[in-house]
Interface confidence: low
């Protein structure tokens, strides 16, 4: 046996050469350098600028790459889904030396990470995914995708995150590899759009008049612009924006005794408008009086009969039906009469008399306007 | 730019009325709740009066209600405070204000105007 | 009415200073609150509203945090420019303004 030295050179993080000396007992068998770095993994560095990439070779020694230029591991001005051969060697291994296929891959630049979540959709979920905007000739069987958003991995083109928080931020990492290497990653933050707001509590809703009603509520919890009103009266429905500050609203001009539906909702005008939840309620408004009835007929149907008849008033405005007919000769009233319908037959009245027939509607709660006729009885023909 | 300027403090003994006016320009005026507010010299700032972007609501506080009217002119894009029966507390800078569309607050204020209620 | 109550209504602090204001309201207010700055001789200006949202073209080194009854106003990094009244105001039933908080400089 006798003694062999060998010298290793390597760099240290300050970048300046330490040399150690290694005294061994037998004849070194040092490795294959296709053994040693059999299996060496690769990151891919892009020039924005020269649109050309580096190959950075992930090894400890400064190795030597045969006819291509290598410094500091790096192999440079590499371009963009072209191969390129590597021979690397080094003073630690013998031949045969490591034959390194670079596989380049895709310029950076023709990838985008695209926000694809939809606005209708922007406060509950978050869409992600790359979108290749030039074409590349590397194979794209080759490429692979990841996602990582909180401790969720995803290894998909395309991410979509759902039952998110409203007005939330998110964070999502993500990187593409070409042949299992990375070559680019981005981040992004999103924050979740405003969420719907909540429903409005109503504190009374109530009608206290013929013509009004009023509504009180306490504003929903989460972010809204304004409120939207709506009062729906048999098939007619209105609706009103109200400002964010109310918290009351008096409604005027309603019809009397009319049944309202009430419906109020919050809304938020965000990505796209959101309603929230609406809150109902109901009133009856009080009676009032009721219209004229019209088109009163008085005729004749003997010397002293008369029938008189009358279209229903147009707005009743009470609860109940009913006809009255007065008949007055001079001052003093001498028939008094009250129908279900406006149909009444007046007999038994003085011949050659002018009379007064007043017809109007009762709704139970109040008359309404008389509709007023004069007519005469004629001189007995018998 | 979103611009108010205010107009209209003077010097006056007290029971007697002034109005004041507010200009608005850079905006939409008639999308916008307005509103008053004054601040003793020195001191805090205190609201009265606000209306809304029609003027169908109106809000004061007990301090100036039945004594003040805040009112608008949308197609002048003017706001106005009648003051009446003034006291010597009404005596402040008065400034208007633009109420922010997304909050209750005021997102624009005016430089003021100085109201004095003396004898 | 509600009432506000702000504290402290005086304060001293050094440039680069953490520094917050507190406002209590006297009862929940819902996070209808916004904070606003004034300097001396000029009208206030809003620098927060809703509790935590950041008004435009109002530096980051001011938030605002809190629910209920209880706000407050935190300025990260105390900066020369800072020197101000700050006041408080709730806005969930009429106005209500706090007393202030009148900042100036070690």
């Known amino acids: 046996a006798y003694l062999n030295a060998s010298e290793t050179t390597t760099l240290s993080p300050s970048g300046s050469a330490v040399i150690s000396t290694t005294t061994i007992a037998t004849t070194p068998s040092k490795p294959t350098c296709d053994e040693k770095y059999a299996n060496i993994t690769v990151d891919y560095l892009y020039n924005k600028e020269t649109k050309l990439f580096t190959a950075k070779l992930n090894v400890n020694e400064n190795v030597e790459c045969g006819n291509n230029t290598c410094t500091n591991n790096e192999v440079h001005n590499l371009t963009e889904c072209k191969n390129a051969s590597v021979s690397i060697s080094h003073n630690s291994c013998t031949a045969p030396d490591k034959t390194l296929i670079l596989d380049v891959p895709p310029g950076v630049e023709k990838f985008q990470l695209h926000d694809c979540t939809q606005v209708e959709k922007a406060d509950t979920t978050i869409c992600l995914k790359w979108k290749n905007i030039e074409t590349f000739t590397c194979d794209t069987q080759n490429i692979t995708y990841r996602f990582q958003c909180g401790n969720m991995i995803f290894d998909n083109k395309e991410i979509k995150l759902e039952n998110l928080e409203p007005e939330h931020e998110y964070k999502c990492d993500s990187e593409i590899l070409y042949n299992n290497h990375k070559f680019t990653n981005a981040s992004k933050i999103i924050k979740t759009d405003f969420g719907s707001p909540g429903e409005p509590q109503i504190i009374f809703c109530r009608s206290e008049a013929a013509h009004q009603g009023v509504i009180t509520w306490n504003p929903p919890q989460r972010s809204f612009h304004n409120f939207t009103l709506c009062y729906i009266k048999e098939t007619e429905k209105d609706c009103l924006n109200l400002d964010k500050n109310l918290i009351k609203y008096d409604l005027q001009n309603l019809k009397p005794y009319t049944k309202y539906v009430l419906s109020l909702h919050a809304y938020i005008i965000a990505k796209v408008q959101r309603n929230g939840s609406a809150a109902m309620c109901h009133f009856t408004t009080k009676s009032a009086p009721p219209s004229q009835v019209w088109n009163m007929t008085v005729s004749m149907t003997s010397d002293n009969s008369m029938h008189v008849k009358c279209r229903p008033p147009r707005d009743r405005n009470g609860p109940h039906e009913r006809y009255h007919l007065e008949v007055e000769a001079g001052n003093t009233l001498v028939r008094n009469e009250s129908h279900k319908n406006c149909d009444f037959r007046v007999k038994d009245l003085q011949y050659s008399t002018d009379y007064t027939f007043k017809a109007y509607f009762h709704n139970g709660d109040y008359p309404g306007e008389p509709f007023i006729l004069h007519h005469s009885t004629s001189y007995n023909s018998k | 730019e979103v611009q108010l300027v205010e107009s209209g403090g003077d010097l006056v003994q007290p029971g007697r009325s002034l109005k004041l006016s507010c200009v608005a320009s850079g905006f939409t005026f008639n999308n916008y709740w307005m509103t008053w507010i004054r601040q003793v010299p020195g001191k805090g700032l205190e609201w009265v009066a606000s209306?809304?972007?029609?003027?169908?609501?109106?809000y004061y506080p007990d301090s100036v209600k039945d004594r003040f009217t805040i009112s608008r002119d949308n197609a002048k894009n003017t706001l106005f405070l009648q003051m009446n029966s003034l006291r010597s507390e009404d005596t402040a800078t008065y400034y208007c204000?633009?109420?922010?569309?997304?909050?209750?607050?005021?997102?624009?204020w005016g430089q003021g105007t100085s109201v004095t209620v003396s004898s | 009415d509600i009432q506000m109550t702000q504290s402290p209504s005086f304060l001293s602090a050094s440039v680069g200073d953490r520094v917050t204001i507190i406002c209590k309201a006297s009862q929940d207010i819902n996070k209808y609150l916004d904070w606003y700055q004034q300097k001396l001789g000029e009208a206030p200006k809003l620098l927060i509203y809703n509790t935590n949202n950041l008004h435009t073209g109002i530096p980051s080194r001011f938030s605002g945090s809190g629910s209920g009854t209880d706000y407050t106003l935190t300025i990260s990094s105390l900066q020369p420019e800072d020197v101000a009244t700050y006041f408080c105001?709730?806005?969930?039933?009429?106005?209500?303004f706090g007393g202030g908080t009148k900042l100036e400089l070690k």
């Open positions: 209306i809304s972007s029609s003027g169908g609501s109106i």
């Open positions: 204000a633009r109420l922010y569309y997304y909050s209750g607050g005021g997102d624009a």
């Open positions: 105001l709730q806005h969930i039933s009429r106005w209500t």
